[in-house]
Amino acid sequence: FVRTKIDTTENLLNTEVHSSPAQRWSMQVPPEVSAEAGDAAVLPCTFTHPHRHYDGPLTAIWRAGEPYAGPQVFRCAAARGSELCQTALSLHGRFRLLGNPRRNDLSLRVERLALADDRRYFCRVEFAGDVHDRYESRHGVRLHVTAAPRIVNISVLPSPAHAFRALCTAEGEPPPALAWSGPALGNSLAAVRSPREGHGHLVTAELPALTHDGRYTCTAANSLGRSEASVYLFRFHGASGAST
């Protein structure tokens, strides 16, 4: 017999008080956790449930992206009576359970954060013994990953009429401001920032027409730091090629 409950409300961390001995299903997660790329972060998740002395098999699950349907990034299972939750899935080996599900704690540690980890995560617990029940966080916890700028691509490309243009793409969070400097550009030319669709942390700046030979430098900066990279344009005069 499978019995399940979902509360229509989800409480923030440490805000729920139960006066009645008959607990309801609920999950407590903070709305957001912030950490820097390369560091580790802890995603807190605690829960209450109505099965007071349940010690049967249980499964703890974390999903990314969306509740109920999103891909699992972590899963562990604990046998009847056991406090050890044996990891069955840890995406890229970077997810580790910190909490003890037997003590209503599903908190997760994420190692070696990358900007791609910046998304919403949802905890879920499943009972599968004498009691069959499950519960999942509906709103989840947003993992906000910050990062100093990094220039991921800088290039010179041909344009119509034997002209050339330069492209600079950088990533960071907050998204970095990009600026170009180079021959006849003066003291740094600020470029319009255009976050690329589907790549929220990537920004690209273009120099549409390179009129002089020489070194062109792209600088990316945000509140966490700055990064720069250069490209060289040397045209073979009398020919239509270029050396970069």
Partner: antibody, heavy 122, light 107 residues
């Protein structure tokens, strides 16, 4: 491509047996609970059976309990329904269906096969 | 077993109309309810899960609401391709049960 493909349906006499298969592709089969749902001609949908991702737990509708057996071979990405002691009232299109979200439970069925017709008649 | 009762059994409507189908459970099923669309000769298609979550790829004119025992599926502005039969299904407890279906026909 994510899909489910049933096979094994056909005409069988009352008391006879059939084995339905459902070949899955395009997703991590072993992570998902799988089910069989049937639909008698001109009627509504009826849940038949569910098996958890690891195959450790199986569940049946009372109308088929003791006669039908659900199983899966995760190495072959295939779900089965062994149907014995078939009755006229088992005549239906049989669909296999995947649970939404990788977990043991079927929170909903987000992927369905095209169905295979089982006719029980003498 | 939990009984699922849909109403109406059939409904006639025109393109552009707003249509609401209701589903009532015989006991509290929290939010463990899904809605499916089925066209003749085809497999059902998931529209809504966990009462109000829109399945990926399903047009936003479909929406679900409710919890406990009373649930609704709303189509905000009917399109020609929406004429079909709609089923609700509870996944609160086994045996999973479906409503008897609501046939949506062109007026």
């Amino acid at each position: 491509e994510v899909q489910l493909l049933e096979s094994g349906g056909g005409l069988v006499q009352p008391g006879g047996s059939l084995r339905l298969s459902c070949a899955a592709s395009g997703f991590t089969f072993s992570s998902y609970a799988m089910s069989w749902v049937r639909q008698a001609p001109g009627k509504g949908l009826e849940w038949v059976s569910t098996i958890w991702g690891g195959g450790g737990s199986t569940y049946y509708a009372d109308s088929v309990k003791g006669r039908f057996t659900i199983s899966r071979d995760n190495s072959k990405n295939t779900l089965y329904l062994q149907m014995n002691s078939l009755r006229a009232e088992d005549t239906a299109v049989y669909y296999c269906a995947k649970a939404i979200g990788s977990s043991w439970y079927s929170d909903a069925f987000d992927l369905w096969g095209q169905g295979t017709m089982v006719t029980v008649s003498s | 077993d939990i009984q699922m009762t849909q109403s109406p059994s059939s409904v006639s409507a025109s393109v552009g109309d707003r249509v609401t189908i209701t589903c009532r459970a015989s006991q509290d099923i929290s939010s463990w309810l899904a809605w499916y669309q089925q066209k003749p000769g085809k497999a059902p298609k998931l529209l809504i899960y966990v009462a109000s979550s829109l399945q990926s790829g399903v047009p936003s004119r479909f929406s679900g609401s409710g919890s406990g025992t009373d649930f609704t599926l709303t189509i905000s502005s009917l399109q020609p391709e929406d004429f079909a039969t709609y089923y609700c299904q509870q996944s609160y407890s086994i045996p999973y049960t479906f409503g008897q279906g609501t046939k949506l026909e062109i007026k």
